[in-house]
């Protein structure tokens, strides 16, 4: 398997140069179109886990606790991405670690991560066929953050 | 420029097969060694910005506010990464948005992100020479999170 990185297989003939022909410089001008996760993953709030623990990993000690949900795509690099799912609508009190404080909102922090998709190269066949790698921006929620509610002017 | 993805240019002869020779399967077993940021960036706490605003972006509205520091490497994909720098040692009070609450710590959330480094392929020269892409895990701080201090057993 030989992998090449290119702009996108939308205009396939220029996607993968033949082994003899070296690709032009522009071949690396990657598209940066955004890709969304497979389906909108609802930010459901699980009351039973809406608490900030005093030990364990950072996502469970946070006053805006979250869990991680796996998003796997075998033709993407990286194959496994994790989306943060906020467990509470509001921030948990620092005092009790359980009661919610309506003064703070627990909100997801989004990030457009660079990922690559493996696509068969146009006209490539056989056991040693090459693949094109399409670069994309993929929206992931990294964590949940406790913020002061936005005040509208 | 033709980019190929491979295990790492530590054993360069197998890094970039000739145009005639199809790469062996192992050629894709990338190393996943962690890479540290260019220099240790100190977590200085800026008193003047240690406040949670009521508008603006999420990192300034958070009660664990942070700024972003650019880390640019032209031979890496992505070229630009941003490291979150916590602006306060403790979380800011939800009531005032300025006073710190010693019950909460503002801590960075670290993540090992997949990046690629462009390396010249061994023995490749001329205007159309190819490059190897080395896959690496690169530690970035994504955000700062307000957590309850860890209680030691």
């Amino acid at each position: 398997v030989s992998l090449r990185i290119q702009e996108g297989c939308s205009h396939l003939p220029s996607c993968c140069p033949s082994k003899e022909q070296e690709p032009p410089e522009e071949w690396l001008k990657w598209s940066s179109a955004s890709v969304s996760p497979p389906e909108p993953l609802s930010h459901t709030h699980h009351a039973e886990s809406c608490r900030a623990s005093k030990d364990g990993p950072l996502n469970s000690r946070a006053i805006s606790p979250w869990s991680y949900e796996l998003d796997r795509d075998l033709n993407r690099v990286p194959q496994d991405l994790y989306h943060a799912r906020c467990l509470c609508p509001h921030c948990v009190s620092l005092q009790t670690g359980s009661h919610m404080d309506p003064l703070g909102n627990s909100v997801p922090l989004y990030h457009n991560q660079t990922v690559f998709y493996r696509r068969p190269c146009h006209g490539e066949e056989g056991t040693h066929r090459r693949y094109c790698l399409e670069r994309r921006l993929y929206r992931v929620s990294l964590a949940c953050v406790c913020v002061r509610p936005r005040v509208m002017a | 420029v033709s980019l190929r993805i491979q295990e790492g240019c530590s054993h360069l002869p197998s890094c970039c097969p000739s145009k005639e020779q199809e790469p062996p399967e192992e050629w894709l077993k990338w190393s996943s060694a962690s890479v540290s940021p260019p220099e240790p960036l100190s977590h200085t706490h800026h008193a003047e910005s240690c406040r949670a605003s009521k508008d603006g972006p999420l990192n300034s509205r958070a009660i664990s506010p942070w700024s972003y520091e650019l880390d640019r490497d032209l031979n890496r994909v992505p070229q630009d990464l941003y490291h979150a720098r916590c602006l306060c040692p403790h979380c800011v009070s939800l009531q005032t948005g300025s006073h710190m609450d010693p019950l909460g710590n503002s801590v960075p959330l670290y993540h090992n992100q997949t990046v690629f480094y462009r390396r010249p392929c061994h023995g490749e020269e001329g205007t159309h020479r190819r490059y190897c892409l080395e896959r690496r895990l690169y530690r970035v701080s994504l955000a700062c999170v307000c957590v309850r201090p860890r209680v030691m057993a």
């Epitope: 949900e69 796996l70 990286p78 194959q79 496994d80 | 894709l28």
Partner: antibody, heavy 125, light 107 residues
């Protein structure tokens, strides 16, 4: 050698919860995802979900939404699967299975390469 | 979810026979298919991953083939210890799904 040892059989009443444990040994616990699969008597294998012990990340079959909780205790290399609001049709043998990854990185192939011995959970009033 | 249909649901064969079990996916799964063996005592073992690659320690009489939606597990010469139920499983997309199983008996 890789071993997954599960907790013993349980009898539960409808509406109760059950928590099955799976102790791993012979490999790096945090380096491999753990799957949970169940099998009602004489029936097909049914995938319930998986957990990454490194970050606690999970994925589960939609039908178990809100009823299944998968957790790990890294300090003792143990994975747990808790199923709540039990019904009689939850009577089954529950298996944990390590997920191995194979083939050229970064395009891995995944397979449940080592399985626990199974834990029979009986739900009966 | 991707549906996996296995056939036959049961079969009886003699020692030394060539045995074939088929598995059909409800959509193209790009060879992302595994085969498992469940012994009568409930023990489950991985036999084959990625359609045709034998897992460590699996006898060479087992082989797998197929592409697209249709896959096959073959035992070239049936042995008494092969008495078991065989399952296919797709890992093309979460949630993972298994076939209904094929119970293999010796005549």
């Amino acid at each position: 050698q890789v071993q997954l040892v599960q907790s013993g059989a349980e009898v539960k009443k409808p509406g109760a919860s059950v928590k099955v444990s799976c102790k791993a040994s012979g490999y790096s616990f945090t380096g491999y995802t753990m799957n949970w699969v169940r099998q009602a008597h004489g029936k097909n294998l049914e995938w319930m979900g998986l957990i990454n012990p490194d970050n606690g990340g999970t994925s589960h079959k939609q039908k178990f939404q809100g009823r299944v909780t998968m957790t790990v205790d890294k300090s003792i290399s143990t994975a747990y699967m808790e199923l709540s609001r039990l019904r009689s049709d939850d009577t089954a043998v529950y298996y944990c299975a390590r997920e191995g990854y194979y083939g050229p990185s970064p395009f891995h192939h995944y397979a449940m390469d080592y399985w626990g011995q199974g834990t029979l959970v009986t739900v009966s009033s | 979810d991707i549906q996996m249909t296995q056939s036959p649901s049961s079969l009886s064969a003699s020692v030394g026979d060539r045995v074939t079990i088929t598995c059909q996916a409800s959509q193209d799964i790009s060879n992302y298919l595994n085969w498992y063996q469940q012994k009568p005592d409930g023990t489950i073992k991985l036999l084959i991953y990625y359609t045709s690659t034998l897992h460590t320690g699996v006898p060479s009489r087992f082989s797998g083939s197929g592409s697209g939606t249709d896959y096959t597990l073959t035992i070239s010469s049936l042995q008494p210890e092969d008495i078991a139920t065989y399952y296919c499983q797709q890992y093309s997309k979460l949630p993972y799904t298994f076939g209904g199983g094929t119970k293999l008996e010796i005549k």
